[in-house]
């Protein structure tokens, strides 16, 4: 409408009792430059005078300024363009509405601002992202609607109390589209920040506490387990039972399922917090954990290495090598599977203890005929002696002996 | 669903013994932490104790510690509430809850997602 004059500014502005308030304002007159300018306080037209009644906060005429009793009320424009107004300190009583009455040489305007001014500081408002996962970086942000030239603050960001350690990064908004003290803090959280409290404080230029915001934060992780086993070295012998036991520290949200796991693999059947294993054999010996799933994801817990410990089994002999030349070296292997491994060894050729040897390798640096035959070996742990395997044959090859002729 | 029932209240003299259950349907219940809590007339919910799945972890309120004992039995689905040396302080209205969060939030009434109706428990001198 080309009959109305233009302003900008921002609907509502929002201080506290001895702070100040700072306007930003622009404007265009519909016809030449501003004559008179008077900023009233709740301002209602008196139809029988066609004049505005109301409190004067500011009274400025074509021949100068009006004294004014309201030092604190600053008019900061000019006379076409900005109608920018700061009040400094600003009064609870200043609430309502500030009339904006402007006259040029044939026209006037009276433009209307609202102000909201609380008896005590109102607190800031923590703005979190819809979702928070572990570990997943997040800006919080705390927004405070307020800013003035001359009344400095700041936001203070604090986690259960304690200020936190990241930077936060401070900015403000003095326009006449909107006015007001920002902070933002990029923070990376962990699932133990799960029902912790954040706070952002609004403090004065000195940090002396003027009011808080805080939220508890719902940080969604998968399941943190711990897992406990009987015996705690997790060693036992064959035909010994175990039981593993696995507990969920934290879950967020609700966990729905359980397994165990054994080297990595499912195993069937197994779906509470606890694994009995009865009369375990060998080959139960393995790395075990939990795995507890929510709609994040699956939690494992730490993995427990299962030992199961057993007598050696029957002995197997390797030769390097057979045959062997007169002359040349060979050695002998004794192999026997074994938890702990066997601590001594015997010796067998051609069915005959062989003296002096009870190492897991015998050395024969030179072969003579006669060792050729069959070696076989016992191997022997802390829980008993192996049998003894089918052995393994040594074929000595020689040149012609005692050569006769016929 | 899950769905929990108490029962083993009733009165008591002071000095006494009651021994609360909390039988569970579905097979979920042994795979929840349980918990049991009480109200007063005219005071809060108060958290009295919780055990982990597995029986392995176990929580009392400083209130109720070394009288009262909470066990399981998840081949029956039920929790227990063995409660000794009961006292005036003690008469309330005892419900048991499943919570599936973790150990952390035992004695935390909201995290708990269901609720039996609860037994009353009363306490005469």
């Known amino acids: 409408d080309s009959s109305k004059w233009v302003f900008e500014h921002p609907e509502t502005l929002y201080a506290w009792e001895g702070a100040c308030v700072w306007i930003p304002c622009t404007y265009r007159a519909l016809d030449g430059d501003l004559e008179s300018f008077i900023l009233f306080h709740n301002p209602e037209y008196n139809k029988n005078t066609s004049k505005f009644d109301g409190t004067r906060l500011y009274e400025s005429t074509k021949d100068g300024k009006v004294p004014s009793e309201q030092k604190r009320v600053q008019f900061l424009g000019d006379k076409n363009k900005n109608c920018t107004l700061s009040i400094h300190p600003v009064h609870l009583n200043d609430s309502g509405q500030l009339g904006l009455r402007m006259e040029s040489k044939t026209e006037k305007w009276m433009e209307r601002i609202h102000l909201n001014v609380s008896e005590r500081p109102f607190p800031p408002h923590i703005q979190l992202p819809p979702e928070i996962q572990e570990s997943q970086e997040v800006t919080l942000t705390c927004l405070l609607n307020f800013s003035c030239y001359g009344y400095p603050i700041q936001l203070q960001w604090l986690l259960e109390g304690v200020p936190m350690r990241q930077a936060a990064v401070t900015s403000t908004s003095l326009t006449i589209k909107s006015v007001f003290t920002r902070s933002e803090l990029k923070f990376s959280p962990q699932w133990s920040h799960h029902g912790k409290i954040v706070t952002c404080q609004l403090q004065d230029a000195d940090g002396k506490f003027l009011s808080n915001d805080t939220v508890q934060l719902n940080v969604k992780h998968t399941p943190k387990l711990e897992i406990k086993v009987t015996p705690s070295d997790a060693i036992v012998r064959e035909g010994d039972s175990v039981t593993m036991t696995c507990e969920v520290s934290s879950s967020n949200p609700e966990y729905t399922t359980v397994s165990w796991l054994k080297d990595g693999t499912s195993l069937k059947k197994q779906n509470t917090f606890t694994l009995n294993l009865r009369e375990v054999t060998k080959d139960q010996s393995g790395k075990y954990c939990c795995q507890v799933s929510n709609d994040v994801g699956p939690g494992r817990s730490e993995e427990v290495f299962l030992q199961v410990q057993y007598a050696p089994e029957p002995s197997t002999v390797q030769i390097l090598h057979s045959p062997a030349v007169e002359g040349s070296q060979v050695e002998f292997l004794c192999m026997s599977l074994a938890n702990p491994l066997p601590t001594n060894y015997t010796w067998y050729h051609n069915g005959k203890e062989m003296q002096g040897r009870t190492e897991e390798k015998v050395h024969i640096p030179k072969i003579l005929p006669w060792h050729a035959g069959t070696y076989s070996c016992v191997a022997e742990n802390i829980l008993g002696t192996g049998q003894r395997g089918p052995g393994a044959e040594l074929d000595v090859q020689y040149p012609p002996k005692k050569v006769t002729t016929v | 669903q899950l769905q929990l029932v108490e029962s083993g209240g009733g009165l008591v003299q002071a000095g006494g013994s009651l021994r609360l259950s909390c039988v569970g349907s579905g097979d979920r219940v042994s795979i929840a932490l349980m918990g049991w809590f009480r109200q007063a007339p005219g005071k809060e919910r108060e958290f009295v104790a919780a055990?982990?799945?597995?029986?392995?972890?176990?929580t009392y309120s400083d209130s109720v510690k070394g009288r009262f004992t909470i066990s399981r039995d998840n081949a029956k689905n039920t929790v227990y509430l063995q409660m000794n040396s009961l006292k005036r302080d003690d008469t309330a209205v005892y419900v048991c809850?499943?919570?599936?969060?973790?150990?952390?939030?035992?004695?935390?009434?909201?995290?708990?997602?269901?609720w039996g109706q609860g037994t009353q428990v009363t306490v005469s001198s």
């Open positions: 055990i982990s799945p597995s029986g392995g972890r176990i």
């Open positions: 809850a499943a919570n599936f969060r973790g150990y952390l939030s035992s004695s935390r009434g909201s995290d708990y997602a269901y």
